[in-house]
């Protein structure tokens, strides 16, 4: 899996989308997890409704929401009030049994709010981005 980069501005919301084959993943719940280290486990942040038919209902865990368009084949994750500590590697996952198949690997980057200079030292600025092979950037 290539890594797709999503960039958001600190304090604002960031929407991450993960497309998938709706028939291939039919009946499967989805999840959003945070990668702990390069080869560490992916820690579950939030998952879709326990009843697959209700996957369209938005579920929240703290400032992170998840909703699944099971017919269209798009999983959407919203990170509300984006903070510097939200930056990092994540995965969209498709679940069956206790198995989790990766739908997309996501790098979340937090950009400085141009109107807020208070914590500028903690924030990532364009130009300091790590290079990701075949990375696709979405705003």
């Amino acid at each position: 899996h290539n890594t797709t980069v999503f960039q958001g501005v600190a304090g604002q919301s960031l929407q991450v989308s993960c497309p998938y084959d709706s028939m291939k993943h039919w009946g499967r719940r989805k999840a959003w997890c945070r990668q702990l280290g390069e080869k560490g486990p992916c820690q579950r942040v939030v998952s879709t409704h326990n009843l697959w038919l209700l996957s369209f209902l938005r579920r929240w865990n703290g400032s992170t929401a998840i909703t699944d368009d099971t017919l269209g084949g798009t999983l959407t994750i919203t990170l509300r009030n984006l903070q510097p500590h939200d930056a990092g590697l994540y995965q969209c996952q498709s679940l069956h049994g206790s198995e989790a198949d990766t739908l997309r690997k996501v790098l979340v980057e937090v950009l400085a709010d141009p109107l807020d200079h208070r914590d500028a030292g903690d924030l990532w600025f364009p130009g300091e981005s790590e290079s990701f092979e075949d990375a696709h950037v979405e705003h």
Epitope: D21, K24, W26, G27, W52, L95, H96, G97, S98, E99
Partner: antibody
Framework: QVQLQESGPELVKPGASVKISCKAS????????MNWVKQRPGKGLEWIGR????????DYNGKFKGKATLTADKSSNTAYMQLTSLTSEDSAVYFC??????????????WGQGTLVTVSA | DIQMTQTTSCLSASLGDRVTISCRAS??????LSWYQQKPDGTVKLLIY???KLHSGVPSRFSGSGSGTDYSLTIGNLEQEDVATYFC?????????FGGGTRLEIK
């Protein structure tokens, strides 16, 4: 109704390869995962792997990696399993089965009749 | 891999009996357990999924129960057509694994 018709019995020599087929009817072949299971004479069942005919994506039991290769032909609604470097341990009945997802996990709902593969010099 | 153990390989019972077949997993499988019936002619059918849910068309004399690592299949009123081998299978974790099977005979 759903039917899975497997190919006929095979007698093959040690070291040779065999390709068995499973023709599906009664449902949209491309949209369901297909399972493959091995049963040695008088023994239990072993999961070999599964394939999604829509894009050819396959998952294997580590024990069968390098031994079995799963493919599918959407135009003929047929799933195939090729077994290579055959030994007597590969003598078995091989089943294909259509997978359904129920309550969040996969279940083999419809099974083929099985193909007997005999490896003998 | 998760090991599935059916301790009884062969079971003999009389028509009308209540028969229970057990299956144990080497770790918690979260109720992701299915039961299959293989008739003497080799045909395989799904009986029960998710521990206790009866597949459509399966007679109500079949039932399943269990949790964690211990599961069972019960046939409430044994009939001649129930002569078969019964396999449990876990669908929790890849690779999916089966029990060794329990062959059911009529006394």
């Amino acid at each position: 109704q759903v039917q899975l018709q497997e190919s006929g019995p095979e007698l093959v020599k040690p070291g040779a390869s065999v390709k068995i087929s499973c023709k599906a009817s009664g449902y949209i072949f491309s949209y369901s995962w297909m399972n493959w299971v091995k049963q040695r004479p008088g023994k239990g069942l072993e999961w070999i792997g599964r394939i999604y005919p829509g894009d050819g994506d396959a998952d294997y039991n580590g024990k069968f990696k390098g031994k079995a290769t799963l493919t599918a032909d959407k135009s003929s609604n047929t799933a195939y399993m090729q077994l290579t470097s055959l030994t007597s341990e590969d003598s078995a009945v091989y089943f294909c089965a259509r997978l359904h997802i129920y309550d969040g996990y996969y279940v083999s709902v419809y099974w083929g009749q099985g193909t007997l593969v005999t490896v003998s010099a | 891999d998760i090991q599935m153990t059916q301790t009884t390989s062969c079971l003999s019972a009389s028509l009308g009996d209540r028969v229970t077949i057990s299956c144990r997993a080497s770790q918690d499988i979260n109720n992701y357990l299915s039961w299959y019936q293989q008739k003497p002619d080799g045909t395989v059918k799904l009986l029960i999924y998710y521990t206790s849910k009866l597949h459509s068309g399966v007679p109500s004399r079949f039932s399943g129960s269990g949790s964690g690592t211990d599961y069972s299949l019960t046939i409430g009123n044994l009939e001649q057509e129930d002569v078969a081998t019964y396999f449990c299978q876990q669908g929790d974790t890849l690779p999916w694994t089966f029990g060794g099977g329990t062959r059911l005979e009529i006394k």
